[in-house]
Structure formats: structure tokens, C-alpha cells
């Protein structure tokens, strides 16, 4: 999906207003020191194409977060504030129902969440310079 | 205060399309979104989409897409929402809705008086 | 059939209490999602009640208050009046992508006997 036509401003403020409250819960317990962000984005598309990658896409030790609240609500902002995002993940969402596991927080999914704090922040200041 | 005065009472054949008009005043219109949202007789409300009064960006719910177009005038501070292909049951009110929250996530703050759009052969 | 469940109708006498249930499922309202209220008096547009489970708009009188706990919200009223028989609507979103994101109860018809 090409989220370049997507409402950035208001994705922005659903993530302030929910999506990254319910990161901060997700990683309770866990020192921010914790975790080195090795994950980057250059601009508010490709933040969120990363953002979708990382949420919704299953990784080693890390199986599935697409039941969290804060991916459940990352997907309905993308799908509000995004044109015809809706259609492209249709498809994309029954193949991984059939992949789906058990919910397990292991370390490497709060690794994955503190780097999709660190995409989410970085979504949230679009004019800074990459580093 | 927030108006939103929307065109009258339609009557269609089915297959025929229909053209809504919303005009808004009492606040400045390209500051909002607008949603357009019907309500089926002894029914709940159901979302339909949103336009951007400012930039003129859409999204359409999927049950509406490829029968539902929203455009906007902002020289005369109106929403239109035209839905083509009519079927009876697609008699409804057909209400827009100002957006409220800066939470962003839709909230229907405002509310026009609706117009009633019937599909009967 | 909607997406959230309300009961079709209640009823209560002047100056009581009554409340009004909308049930949906951890796709949306179990998802943590905000949900909100609105009131439509016969022959009427929707009016915003409640907004973001618990907060009133401005005009809106102290009687009429909201909750959410696990899947389900509730709306209550105290102090029943003539002037609250409507039809009361909960709203919320709604993470499947097959339906509307945007989603409507089915509505609760309140009369004031």
C-alpha cells in the first residue's frame, strides 16, 4: 500500500490520543535504555509503511502483535485516514489469520514495540533530519 | 452557531443516481471534515466516508465504493455526496455530519436535518 | 444487524433511573476503542450526547452520563423526563476492515411512562 494520501495529521493525533498509550501499557515494566532503535524511517510514508511492517507483519520470536490494542487501533487510523487502504488488506489479513499463534509477550516482541515507539515518535516530528 | 442545511426530499427510480447538497455556516467550513452517514427506516445510523472540505480527499466505506461520490464547493461552503446505482434498499435518510474531536477519530459533533431519499419503481 | 447491540427499547417512570446497554466484541469496544452517544428525538437529526465514553458537550445535562468497562458501554439517565423519549444510539470503531471502521448500535427506543 502507498500510504502517501493518507491524512497524516490525523493519524498523528489518533496515535496521541490512543495508539501510543497503548504502546506505553504494552511495555510497562520495561526500562526505554532497554532496547537500541535499529529501525529508521525518512519520511511520514515510509514511517508507516515501516509502522504496518513491524505491526502487523509476523517476525522470528515475535509472532503475532495484530491482537494487541495498540495494533487493532493502528490498523482501524490507517484504515479511517487512508483511502482505499481498507481493500488492499483484505487479502493480506486472511493469509495471516491462518498463520496466526497463541498470544506471548517474549522479549523480542517488546524489542519490536520499542521499535515501533521509536518509528511512531519519529512519524510524529517529520521535519527533523534523519541522524 | 454550527448550521448545516441540506437539500430536500428525493424520489428515484432504482438504477437512478442521487445528489445531496450540505451547506455549512457558523464556522469555517475547510476547518473540518465533513461525513455523510444514512439511516435506513427502524434502523441504526451507517457510516458511508468522509471528505476534506480543505484539500477535497475521499475515502468511502468498501459497502459504498464505486456507487458514492463526495465533493465539496468551498466557494459556497457546501458538501455533496451523490450515490449512483440506486436500489430500494437504499431508501434512507442521508445526513451529513460535522467532525467534533481532535482526537483523531471520527466524531459526529454536528448534524444536518437529513434528507430523505426514496428508491421505489 | 449492527455491529454493536443495544436492547430495542426501555422504559422508566418520571424521576427515575434507567440505563442502556450497547455489547460489541473485542474487535472494537474490547479493543479499548472510545465510544460514544447519541440521542435522536422523534422526527429529529442525532444529537451528540456523550463523547469518548464519560464526557458531556456543553448543553448537555449532568442526568444523562456514560461508562465502558470490558466489551460493553452503558448510558445513564437519572431524574427521567418527558423530553429524554428517544431513540439513543452508541457508537464506536472497529477493527475489521471487511465492515465500516466507523460502527453504530442498533438503537434503544426509551419511553417515559
Known amino acids: 500500500y502507498d500510504f502517501t494520501n493518507c491524512d497524516f495529521e490525523k493519524i498523528k493525533a489518533a496515535y496521541l490520543s490512543t495508539i501510543s498509550k497503548d504502546l506505553i501499557t504494552y511495555m510497562s515494566g520495561t526500562k526505554s535504555t532497554e532496547f537500541n532503535n535499529t529501525v529508521s524511517c525518512s519520511n511520514r510514508p515510509h514511517c508507516l509503511t515501516e509502522i504496518q511492517s513491524l505491526t502487523f507483519n509476523p517476525t522470528a520470536g515475535c509472532a503475532s502483535l495484530a491482537k494487541e490494542m495498540f495494533a487493532m487501533k493502528t490498523k482501524a487510523a490507517l484504515a479511517i485516514w487512508c483511502p482505499g487502504y481498507s481493500e488492499t488488506q483484505i487479502n493480506a489479513t486472511q493469509a495471516m489469520k491462518k498463520r496466526r499463534k497463541r498470544k506471548v509477550t517474549t522479549n523480542k516482541c517488546l524489542e519490536q514495540v520499542s521499535q515501533l515507539q521509536g518509528l511512531w515518535r519519529r512519524f510524529n516530528r517529520p521535519l527533523l533530519k534523519q541522524q | 452557531q454550527v448550521q448545516l442545511v441540506q437539500s430536500g426530499a428525493e424520489v428515484k427510480k432504482p438504477g437512478a443516481s442521487v445528489k445531496v447538497s450540505c451547506k455549512a455556516s457558523?464556522?469555517?467550513?475547510?476547518?473540518?471534515?465533513m461525513y455523510w452517514v444514512r439511516q435506513a427506516p427502524g434502523q441504526g445510523p451507517e457510516w458511508m466516508g468522509w471528505i476534506n472540505p480543505n484539500s477535497g480527499g475521499t475515502n468511502y466505506v468498501q459497502k459504498f465504493q464505486g456507487r458514492v461520490t463526495m465533493t465539496r464547493d468551498t466557494s459556497i461552503s457546501t458538501a455533496y455526496m451523490e450515490l449512483s446505482r440506486m436500489r430500494s434498499d437504499d431508501t434512507a435518510v442521508y445526513y451529513c455530519?460535522?467532525?467534533?474531536?481532535?482526537?483523531?477519530?471520527?466524531?459526529?459533533?454536528?448534524w444536518g436535518l437529513g434528507t430523505l431519499v426514496t428508491v421505489s419503481s | 444487524q449492527s455491529v454493536l447491540t443495544q436492547p430495542p427499547s426501555v422504559s422508566g417512570a418520571p424521576g427515575q433511573r434507567v440505563t442502556i446497554s450497547c455489547t460489541g466484541s473485542s474487535s472494537n469496544i474490547g479493543a479499548g476503542f472510545d465510544v460514544h452517544w447519541y440521542q435522536q428525538l422523534p422526527g429529529t437529526a442525532p444529537k451528540l450526547l456523550i463523547y469518548?465514553?464519560?464526557n458531556r458537550p456543553s448543553g448537555v445535562p449532568d442526568r444523562f452520563s456514560g461508562s465502558k468497562s470490558g466489551t460493553s458501554a452503558s448510558l445513564a439517565i437519572t431524574g427521567l423526563q418527558a423530553e429524554d423519549e428517544a431513540d439513543y444510539y452508541c457508537?464506536?470503531?472497529?477493527?475489521?476492515?471487511?465492515?465500516?471502521?466507523?460502527?453504530f448500535g442498533g438503537g434503544t427506543k426509551l419511553t417515559v411512562l
Open positions: 457558523g464556522y469555517t467550513f475547510t476547518d473540518y471534515y
Open positions: 455530519a460535522r467532525d467534533g474531536g481532535s482526537s483523531g477519530w471520527p466524531l459526529f459533533a454536528y
Open positions: 469518548d465514553n464519560n
Open positions: 457508537q464506536s470503531y472497529d477493527s475489521n476492515l471487511s465492515g465500516s471502521i466507523v460502527v
